[in-house]
């Protein structure tokens, strides 16, 4: 209802003499801030005075003064929402009702809180799950309805009076909803914990005992069993008798059924605590145990290993591994069922006893082809000697042996010949299934192990073959030693380095990259004419007439090879200059005359100079000198000079005659 003040706090708080009480509290006043607060002990309303009577434990007024006796009780709240209280220490006679008298400017309220103070520390309470089963983790809870900031406590767990090893988790609550201290312990009980006493002990900060709670554990578990056997070592010979007894040492709840198992399988019609085995056979060897069940489940005893002893049975040989690769290691294992285990072995290879081999295993570190064959063995123990079994076959595999590449052709081989090679070997296991050849080529294999090289190349130097089964064995390479005519013949200028100038000494070299056989002859030719038979062609002083197309030939006993034609070019100054005249050397005045400076030069003439009969240079620099109209005064001797980058050349004089025209003669 909106006319009420709203308070939140625990309904009742618990403590004991000498401890303390912390009262968490919140409130909301109807209007404004709190102006006055009185804490009463067991307040009663006086109708006459319209006030509350009772012991005043705490009082706060507008001036904020607090009497000195109020130090034990503290109001830790404020004027609008917090009403937390603390009583330290708390006494037995503090039990009862606490009344919080609150006054604001216009409203008043009395809030009641119950306080239960006992004479001595009250015990905590242990809470257990409804059922505890062995090896299933459970949480044990110890709860105490007390917590106070001014009075630290601790909760300790004990099993049969001894502190428990497991770590407990302690939590405290001091809220308006609840005040408590709680300890939780996670614990996996074993069947041996059944009936044991668990204690939760309340202690003060110094570990002094204050109170405790105890419970007895009821741990549900499968039956716990012990097995006994006669004879005690459980070792017998065929035909002996054996007795086994099953005893229950603990079961919760009580057991219901009994059975016996051999090698994990239930024995039929054996439902008593005693198992009698008469005239045992070797098949009865094995691991025995008894099984007893209750509502939790079946419990099993430890296993008893019953050994029925007998002489070795016929043996078999196991080979690790067959087929074996030559050079690898092989282990032979003699397998014979016997009890006790055989103490001595005899080994046979192809029916012949292997000397010095008496162990269960025979190890051959490096297998060779002669190790192949049948291996058998005989086992022996204290009860007798077994029989020799059928044995096992060792197959020793190895790469082809002594592989060779053989040339079938008559020697020598010439470039372009068809060469046939065969790949031979001595022995192989498994059989040779294929052959490989090096280097690879687009070659024919007309039959297995035969290689045919059509049109053999000059550079086919060596060939190797491999015979292959599971592995390939390579033969040493065989040299084909192919003979061929000289290759890559070319003309190379040795001197000069660059352009050949007229007068230079010139050396041309006839080069070739290879020849087989090595012995060669050289031939030089120009325009089909033989010039020399040395590797070099030398010109002491070259002239323009030596220019032209040169070739060299290199031959050996297989054939001859020509170089590409090599053009020899000679640079020279202009020569053979002459002045030609058109239309002729006699021209009528008034007509036109053209003088041309003809020359032979390399590089071509780039600059011409014309001179007259007085050796006066004329202002013309092209190859043609054109006189138009020609005059009689032009008559005379002319010469020209040609210049290229090498030098100059001059022509002899050429005379031009200009005669008068009929008109001129007529005028005279």
């Amino acid at each position: 209802d909106s006319s009420k003040w709203v308070f939140e706090h625990p309904e009742t708080l618990y403590a004991w003499e000498g401890a303390c009480v912390w009262i968490p509290c919140t409130y909301r006043a109807l209007d404004g801030d709190l102006e006055s607060f009185i804490l009463f002990h067991n307040p009663e309303y006086n109708k006459n005075t319209s006030k509350f009577d009772g012991t005043r434990l705490y009082e706060s007024t507008k001036d904020g003064k607090v009497p000195s006796e109020q130090k034990r009780v503290q109001f830790l709240g404020d004027k609008n929402k917090n009403c937390t209280l603390s009583i330290h220490p708390v006494h037995l006679n503090d039990s009862g009702q606490l009344g919080l008298r609150m006054e604001s400017k216009t409203e008043k309220w009395m809030e009641r809180i119950h306080l239960n103070v006992s004479e001595r520390p009250f015990p905590p309470h242990i809470q257990l799950p409804p059922e505890i089963q062995e090896s299933q983790e459970v949480t044990l809870t110890c709860l105490l309805n007390f917590s106070c900031y001014g009075y630290p406590i601790q909760l300790q767990w004990l099993l049969e009076g001894v502190p428990m090893r497991q770590a407990a988790v302690t939590s405290t609550s001091l809220t308006i909803k609840s005040v408590f201290t709680r300890s939780e312990l996670k614990f996996s009980p074993q069947w041996s914990h059944h009936g044991k006493i668990v204690t939760c002990q309340l202690q003060d900060a110094d570990g002094k005992f204050l109170s405790n709670d105890t419970v007895q554990l009821n741990v549900k578990h499968t039956p716990k069993l012990e097995i006994k056997v006669t004879p005690s070592d459980a070792i017998v010979r065929e035909g002996d008798s054996v007795t086994m007894t099953c005893e229950v040492s603990s079961s919760n709840p009580e057991y219901t059924t009994v059975s016996w198992l051999k090698d994990g399988t239930s024995l039929k019609k054996q439902n008593t605590f005693t198992l009698n085995l008469r005239e045992v056979t070797k098949d009865q060897s094995g691991k025995y145990c008894c099984q007893v069940s209750n509502d939790v489940g079946p419990g099993r005893s430890e296993e008893v290993f019953l050994q029925v002893q007998y002489a070795p049975e016929p043996s078999t040989v196991q080979i690790l591994h067959s087929p074996a690769v030559e050079g690898s290691q092989v282990e032979f294992l003699c397998m014979s069922l016997a009890n006790p285990l055989p103490t001595n072995y005899t080994w046979y290879h192809n029916g012949k006893e292997m000397q010095g081999r008496t162990e269960e295993k025979v190890h051959i570190p490096k297998i060779l082809p002669w190790h192949a064959g049948t291996y058998s063995c005989v086992a022996e123990n204290i009860l007798g000697t077994g029989q020799r079994g059928p044995g096992a076959e060792l197959d020793v595999q190895y790469p082809p042996k002594k592989v060779t590449t053989v040339i079938q052709n008559p020697m020598p081989i010439r470039e372009g010949d068809t060469v046939t090679l065969s790949c031979n070997y001595n022995s192989s296991n498994p059989s040779v299934t294929r052959y490989e050849w090096k280097p690879h080529g687009a070659w024919e294999e007309p039959s297995l192990g035969v290689l045919k090289i059509q049109n053999v190349g000059w550079d086919n130097t060596t060939i190797a073959c491999a015979a292959c089964n599971s592995w390939c064995s390579w033969a040493s390479p065989v040299a084909l030693n192919v003979q061929y005519a000289p290759r890559d013949v070319r003309v190379r200028k040795i001197k000069p380095l660059s352009e050949i100038h007229s007068g230079n000494s010139v050396s041309l070299q006839c080069d070739f990259s290879s020849s087989h056989p090595k012995e060669v002859q050289f031939f030089w030719e120009k325009n089909g004419r033989l010039l020399g038979k040395e590797s070099q062609l030398n010109f002491d002083s070259i002239s323009p007439e030596d220019a032209g197309s040169y070739s060299c030939w290199v031959n050996n006993s297989i054939g001859q090879t020509a170089s590409k034609a090599w053009t020899l070019e000679v640079l020279y100054a202009p020569r053979r200059l002459r002045v030609s005249m058109s239309p002729g050397d006699q021209v009528m005045e008034g007509k036109s005359a053209t003088l041309t400076c003809e020359s032979d030069a390399n590089p071509p003439v780039s600059h011409y100079t014309w001179f007259d009969w007085n050796n006066q240079s004329l202002p013309y620099h092209s190859q043609k000198l054109r006189l138009e109209p020609v005059k009689v005064q032009h008559s005379g001797a002319y010469w020209c000079q040609g210049t290229n980058s090498v030098g100059k050349g001059r022509s002899p004089l050429s005379t031009l005659t200009v005669y008068y025209s009929p008109e001129t003669i007529g005028r005279r």
Epitope: S498, H501, G503, N504, S541, A573, P603, P604, S606, S645
Partner: antibody, heavy 113, light 107 residues
């Protein structure tokens, strides 16, 4: 192998004449031309002239009035003479076979008073 | 005189890079052109003559091409020892003239 070596005065006063000798080994001057090329400091190459195996010469037109090239085949020597020197004739002077097949290491000329 | 215009005047290149230097003649020189390499403090060395003919002993990464007025020198894959100044020389027309040079440096 072919080797060329220039020898010159190093320092010459302006208006004076320059004479440089190029000594050739490894080939005959009867058969080969010798060119002269110069290179001013930090600049490019300039062709000056050539004397051929037969003794004929060819000079750069810009220097024709100041330059003369001669040789002594028996001593395998070629001579360059440059008259009326100016400061811009300062350069390294090289001799070379034909038009640069083989070069001498050069001789440095400084024209300064 | 024939003027030989060489370009670029200088260039920086990385090892392994392809490098091309060009020379342009002011008139047709008929492939009468050679290329020279000069290293600092050394005399020039001939590499190529007649525009495209490689001198014996010069590495094959050097090649020359061109005709008429336009010519070029190419280094297919630059090596450290190729640093220096490169000159072209025309000898087709008197007087012989060199290009101004191309300085090749490592980037």
């Amino acid at each position: 192998q072919v080797q060329l070596k220039e020898s010159g005065p190093g320092l010459v006063a302006p208006s004076q004449s320059l004479s440089i000798t190029c000594t050739v080994s490894g080939l005959s001057l009867n058969n080969y031309g010798v060119s002269w090329v110069r290179q001013p400091p930090g600049k490019g190459l300039e062709w000056l002239g050539v004397i051929w195996g037969d003794g004929s010469t060819n000079y750069h037109s810009a220097l024709i009035s100041r330059l003369s090239i001669s040789k002594d085949n028996s001593k395998s020597q070629v001579f360059l003479k440059l008259n009326s020197l100016h400061t811009d004739d300062t350069a390294t002077y090289y001799c070379a076979i034909n038009w640069g097949d083989y070069w001498g290491q050069g001789t440095t000329l400084i024209v300064s008073s | 005189d024939i003027k030989m215009t060489q370009s670029p005047s200088s260039m920086n290149a990385s090892l392994g890079e392809r490098v091309t230097i060009t020379c342009k003649a002011s008139q047709d020189i008929n492939s009468y052109l050679s290329w020279f390499q000069q290293k600092p403090g050394k005399s020039p060395k001939i590499l190529i003559y007649r525009a495209n003919r490689l001198i014996d002993g010069v590495p094959s990464r050097f090649s020359g091409s061109g005709s008429g007025q336009d010519y070029s020198l190419t280094i297919s894959s630059l090596e450290y020892e190729d640093m220096g100044i490169y000159y072209c020389l025309q000898y087709g027309v008197f007087p012989l003239t060199f290009g101004a040079g191309t300085k090749l440096e490592l980037k």
